[in-house]
Interface confidence: low
Amino acid sequence: QAAPFPELCSYTWEAVDTKNNVLYKINICGSVDIVQCGPSSAVCMHDLKTRTYHSVGDSVLRSATRSLLEFNTTVSCDQQGTNHRVQSSIAFLCGKTLGTPEFVTATECVHYFEWRTTAACKKDIFKANKEVPCYVFDEELRKHDLNPLIKLSGAYLVDDSDPDTSLFINVCRDIDTLRDPGSQLRACPPGTAACLVRGHQAFDVGQPRDGLKLVRKDRLVLSYVREEAGKLDFCDGHSPAVTITFVCPSERREGTIPKLTAKSNCRYEIEWITEYACHRDYLESKTCSLSGEQQDVSIDLTPLAQSGGSSYISDGKEYLFYLNVCGETEIQFCNKKQAAVCQVKKSDTSQVKAAGRYHNQTLRYSDGDLTLIYFGGDECSSGFQRMSVINFECNKTAGNDGKGTPVFTGEVDCTYFFTWDTEYACVKEKEDLLCGATDGKKRYDLSALVRHAEPEQNWEAVDGSQTETEKKHFFINICHRVLQEGKARGCPEDAAVCAVDKNGSKNLGKFISSPMKEKGNIQLSYSDGDDCGHGKKIKTNITLVCKPGDLESAPVLRTSGEGGCFYEFEWHTAAACVLSKTEGENCTVFDSQAGFSFDLSPLTKKNGAYKVETKKYDFYINVCGPVSVSPCQPDSGACQVAKSDEKTWNLGLSNAKLSYYDGMIQLNYRGGTPYNNERHTPRATLITFLCDRDAGVGFPEYQEEDNSTYNFRWYTSYACPEEP
């Protein structure tokens, strides 16, 4: 007998009855590997309360239709004196991933499951070349489900400072390059779930083989291996492999992008902090409200419910969509359908379809996104039941008394997408969450400018246009409210920009939207400030311009206008530079992504060294070469001499390897005289070169001793970028 759903055959699946503390293991094509359930059990029930096992479905006694799979047993059950046998029934529905079997209910005799999976679809449009189970239950039978992260087309770009390679991954399944418009992925070999793009070549560095694993609480691991036997030449004889560790964040925050933490010998280690790695109970609700202690979230959408026969209407070109939230659409031609979303053809209003039913509802909050899903609608030609996905966005100034209205954004294979701006979707202020921007592979991070708490101070903008008598102080914070300290003590609590003068303080805008890359710079817009007349509110734009090495310059007020409704600041800062780490030899470094090239060899002293004096010590340092000063060791790049007794320490061996990252050039000297600590840590020196166009060669300044490293700061014109 041929297996009814071959895609699901390679794995043993799990489902849970949380109410009764029961774990089911399911193998639809063979038998589960649990001795206690016997040699032919297809569905094995493990009762954790009584610590007992029962086979509730025998692989030999299987019967199947296109959408239903039944496993009988030889065990009788007592159901009102009938001679029934214990059995399991799995109803299959078309889904967009392999999905997960969900426990529905159990009677004395029958254990019911439902499974939304690509394996049940009439057409192959959602089917992957290779896909593995993408969920796991922890010891407390809580489900961790990464299915929402699976991309049906395209891939995730892994964040890595290496500009020469791009690693693209999908979660639990191969990358569908055919449906992806991006040209970079088209060269990826079929079946790959981890595709490494080097120049114009793409390599398969991993395919899914095993399902998701739980390594410890809130830490999930997915491993990909390269199936092809041939070695890749850049892997030094090693077979490529990819390990993705999904980490549940300790507090609510927007999801990060996957980050490459190691890549030696083609063993790619990726860490991805995402709320999808957390157990699902906190993040999903079958009702219209949702709260999660861990995520620090409390949401209630019930005020959006319409009653008295009215619905929200959304225009979808050929169709009109009638929607209600937290209840049925009470439109006459939709009645009896129990539809939360009702699709009506404009040209023929008798053609009515339920695009999701109100009792099939999931409210999901994860990674900063609030989504309401209505599934179980009328079937379409592929066999997939219509469903609607409403993505809510926080908008405190939404119309319709803050309720806003849903907007149809598109349809993909019988799934209808809407966005809905409403104040009821606002989840506490997103601070520290959206403090960067991306532009393709280029990443920008403004978090270095964020001032969190005292003793830090707000940034104060420079305004050259004012006289001392009319002096206005402009206090700014980045991606955060201004700190209520000093002259900003009286600033409105939620202001991210605040103006203070003799008359008091004013909110010039709140941090509501994340920074954007625009015309080569980063734009940060703060809106919803104090009223400025005519029903308008003050808005502030900050243009952040890349200035390598400078994280200290203040913002400058450029203009203010529109009757005090608009302020514009400009800020030259290293935080606006593209994040990319580049290493160079021979005292030069070239950052191809930012287009900067640097040559610090003019700073190398052929004889002698640069001297930096402090109270107790004299420091002698050279750039990309050894210091030639008595009594310093001849191969040291930096050395420390005690003024009292001329005792000398080597602070690191000289080298000429510069690194450039985040607008700063650094030179590391390592392997100096060991400390007298337990581990005998060798002393090391870090010199950070910063751009000052007027400094010429400049000179080193001693900063501080930190973790066995001596830090020097050096302002010099040679650290200023020049176009190659």
């Epitope: 390059t177 088209r186 060269a187 398969d204 890749l232 850049f234 892997c235 191809s592």
Partner: antibody
Framework: QVQLQQPGAELVKPGASVKLSCKAS????????MHWVKQRPGQGLEWIGM????????NYNEKFKSKATLTVDKSSSTAYMQLSSLTSEDSAVYYC??????????WGQGTTLTVSS | ENVLTQSPAIMSASLGEKVTMSCRAS?????MYWYQQKSDASPKLWIY???NLAPGVPARFSGSGSGNSYSLTISSMEGEDAATYYC?????????FGGGTKLEIK
């Protein structure tokens, strides 16, 4: 093992067109870019362009954009380069080359194209 | 386009002699690749990623450099090393080659 087979020679009249072939074997044809390189007698090498058999994506050297057209036939694992409006300047050896974890790890034997009346 | 200039264009060396040839790029490149070509034969990849020897290349060959300046060195010339060597950059399209250095036996 990886092999790129090219015909040894082609003789064509000025003004005509020619379609050079490169048959690949020993690897999955759709996994790698195929490059084409020109070498005039006694001269250096010039990169013409490349094509990816999986999607047909191409990238040309601007200098050869109006001269060369790259195509593939996945079913026969063959890459083609059509050269049009031929002149004596086009007389050269044309190589196809395939990456090997790095550029141009494998080369065809080259096709000697002679443009002569 | 990034122009690669190889020098010298022709050089001769005695057996056992150390040989160095250079390749300068008009714009900085990430890596340099070198190919060996003997008469009437296809080029062969010789050095990749600036300093890695392709399979089968004798250990007497080495490559170095960064930015705009790269070189190929033979520590001790042998008869089979007589050939033309081309450098090539793969940093930016079009992927240019140098004009070649022809190495002959003295």
């Amino acid at each position: 093992q990886v092999q790129l087979q090219q015909p040894g020679a082609e003789l064509v009249k000025p003004g005509a067109s020619v379609k050079l072939s490169c048959k690949a074997s020993g690897y999955t044809f759709t996994n790698y870019w195929m490059h084409w390189v020109k070498q005039r007698p006694g001269q250096g090498l010039e990169w013409i362009g490349m094509i990816h058999p999986n999607s047909g994506s191409t990238n040309y050297n601007e200098k050869f954009k109006s001269k060369a057209t790259l195509t593939v036939d996945k079913s026969s694992s063959t890459a083609y380069m059509q050269l049009s409006s031929l002149t004596s300047e086009d007389s050269a050896v044309y190589y196809c080359a395939r990456p090997h974890g790095y550029p141009f790890g494998y080369w065809g034997q080259g096709t000697t194209l002679t443009v002569s009346s | 386009e990034n122009v690669l200039t190889q020098s010298p264009a022709i050089m001769s060396a005695s057996l056992g002699e150390k040989v160095t040839m250079s390749c300068r790029a008009s714009s900085s490149v990430n890596y340099m690749y070198w190919y060996q070509q003997k008469s009437d034969a296809s080029p062969k990849l010789w050095i990749y990623y600036t300093s890695n020897l392709a399979p089968g290349v004798p250990a007497r060959f080495s490559g170095s450099g960064s930015g705009n300046s790269y070189s190929l060195t033979i520590s001790s010339m042998e008869g089979e090393d007589a050939a033309t060597y081309y450098c090539q950059q793969f940093t930016s399209s079009p992927y240019t080659f140098g004009g070649g250095t022809k190495l002959e036996i003295k």
